[in-house]
């Protein structure tokens, strides 16, 4: 988790002087509780947005937006703490909106936004906005939390972001798999424009089951420049196991930008359709 660039972040708007500060996620009001505290945020919304860094790289960011409740507690609102928690790693990053002037009621509801938390593809987050000062230990909570899911690199907009491109999102191998005679599979895919090796991972399953009955790995050496964007054809031999008929072929590239952690592509061959009630074959041919 990180903030997009480190240029001056702005939270001021007409009628409010405000500055964005780094935060330890432990506001002073936890340690020194105040008697009067503001109510919680209203209508917290988290959306996926995309933003360029000063270097021109494109990153997915969490766009956080919320409004204030129209009650007198805004007179005691000194700011807000924005927190993004990555669920799996428990990593948390916070910033603080510090209000440098008192809020006043005006003709429309106060609305705040922040779009500088960089998020990772295919990761899950919990976003919390805490109004400051935080409540006394037994006081009503004055925060609102929402969960937020970032799509993976197959998502159209995500595909062209810097982290996705670094993991090989622009490579479309267009995998085809066909079943040949004598328990063989023919795998064909398009090579990328990089002299790097590939690995084909074959996993076979019985019909309607998820426990594999055969696994095989095939190494493809790095192509020469004249082979870039060409089709690579590989024939894999299957184990002659009755019913081990559903095959998943996964291709793992080892591009220099992502090494062992590149996006993998896969294709599946289903088991052949079984006829519902096969016609009985007579043991003898009648003479009439």
């Amino acid at each position: 988790l990180r903030l997009l660039d480190h240029r001056a972040l702005v939270c001021s708007q007409p009628g409010l002087n405000c500055t964005v500060k780094n935060s330890t996620c432990l506001d002073d009001s936890w340690i020194h509780p105040r008697n009067l505290t503001p109510s919680s945020p209203k209508d917290l919304q988290i959306q996926l947005h995309f933003a360029h860094t000063q270097q021109g790289d494109l990153f997915p960011v969490a766009h956080i937006e919320w409004t204030l409740q129209t009650d007198a507690s805004i007179l005691y609102l000194e700011g807000a703490e924005l927190s993004v928690l990555q669920l799996n790693t428990n990593e948390r990053l916070c910033v603080r909106f510090e209000f440098l002037s008192k809020l006043r009621h005006h003709h429309r509801r106060w609305r705040f936004t922040f779009s500088h938390f960089v998020v990772d593809p295919d990761q899950e987050y919990e976003v919390t906005v805490h109004h400051l000062p935080k409540p006394i230990p037994d006081g009503d909570p004055n925060h609102q939390s929402k969960n937020f899911l970032v799509p993976d690199c197959e998502h159209a907009r995500m595909k062209v972001t810097t982290p996705c491109m670094s993991s090989g999102s622009l490579w479309d191998p267009n995998i085809t798999v066909e079943t040949l005679e004598a328990h063989q599979l023919r795998v064909s895919f398009t090579l990328w424009n990089e002299s790097t090796h590939y690995q084909i991972l074959l996993t076979s399953f019985p019909h309607m089951e998820n426990h594999s009955c055969f696994e095989h790995m095939h190494h493809i050496p790095a192509p020469r420049p004249e082979e870039f964007h060409q089709r690579s054809n590989v024939t894999l031999t299957l184990r002659n196991l009755k019913g081990c008929c559903r095959h998943q072929v996964q291709i793992q590239p080892f591009f220099s930008s992502c090494l062992n952690d590149c996006l993998r592509h896969s294709a599946t061959v289903s088991c052949p359709e079984m006829p519902d009630t096969p016609e009985p074959i007579p043991d003898y041919m009648p003479l009439w």
Epitope: L87, N90, K146, L149
Partner: antibody, heavy 116, light 107 residues
Framework: QVQLVQSGAEVKKPGASVKVSCKAS????????ISWVRQAPGQGLEWMGW????????KYAQKLQGRVTMTTDTSTSTVYMELRSLRSDDTAVYYC?????????WGQGTLVTVSS | EIVMTQSPATLSVSPGERATLSCRAS??????LAWYQQKPGQAPRLLIY???TRATGIPARFSGSGSGTEFTLTISSLQSEDFAVYFC?????????FGGGTKVEIK
């Protein structure tokens, strides 16, 4: 090929405990959390909670708090779900699933029957 | 907790026809909604997340729409393998909750 393989069916008496395992393969185990979802016979799906495969952090459904414990063993890429003080209404198929908000890969399910 | 309500409970459709399934949340969940398909004796399969984003490998005949409290899953032309039970799930706030399911059966 991402796979989550669960332990076999269990029959337990009321008041007993059950521990179901879920072994993950085909991806970097610590990159995603594992959630548990159960389904009573002929019923819908009920979220039970999740565990972070990265650091063992957990979040449980409030109604199961105090009865459920989820643990992880990174050396074997296995997650465990233990449910204690079993009751007849805990009879269900228990599924492990990858991720913590939306579940993209699921185990095959483990039927736990609670009967005296 | 947020209550998810699916309708209808059962939907009878002929192969090749369009199926429209509804899911309603008891409060606004923005677009934090997923859809799953479950066939008898099998685990659920993720179809759609973020209201409208198809999961990896899901055919284009499945599409999702909606926002706030009203959501729809549309199967444009039902194939034989699409007859199953469909569940919606919100992941906006804890606890995560599922709808009761819609069974899509052959007419």
């Amino acid at each position: 090929q991402v796979q989550l393989v669960q332990s076999g069916a269990e029959v337990k008496k009321p008041g007993a405990s059950v521990k179901v395992s879920c072994k993950a393969s085909g991806y970097t185990f610590t990159s995603y959390g594992i959630s548990w979802v159960r389904q009573a016979p002929g019923q819908g799906l009920e979220w039970m909670g999740w565990i972070s495969a990265y650091n063992g952090n957990t979040k449980y459904a409030q109604k199961l708090q105090g009865r459920v414990t989820m643990t992880t063993d990174t050396s074997t890429s296995t997650v465990y779900m233990e449910l204690r003080s079993l009751r007849s209404d805990d009879t269900a198929v228990y599924y492990c699933a990858r991720k913590q908000l939306v579940f993209d890969y699921w185990g095959q399910g483990t039927l736990v029957t609670v009967s005296s | 907790e947020i209550v998810m309500t699916q309708s209808p409970a059962t939907l009878s459709v002929s192969p090749g026809e369009r199926a429209t399934l509804s899911c309603r949340a008891s409060q606004s969940i923005s677009t934090s909604l997923a859809w799953y398909q479950q066939k008898p004796g099998q685990a659920p399969r993720l179809l759609i997340y973020g209201t409208s984003t198809r999961a990896t490998g899901i055919p284009a005949r499945f599409s999702g729409s909606g926002s706030g409290t009203e959501f729809t899953l549309t199967i444009s032309s039902l194939q034989s393998e699409d007859f199953a039970v469909y569940f919606c799930q919100q992941y906006d706030i804890w606890p995560l909750t599922f709808g009761g399911g819609t069974k899509v059966e052959i007419k």
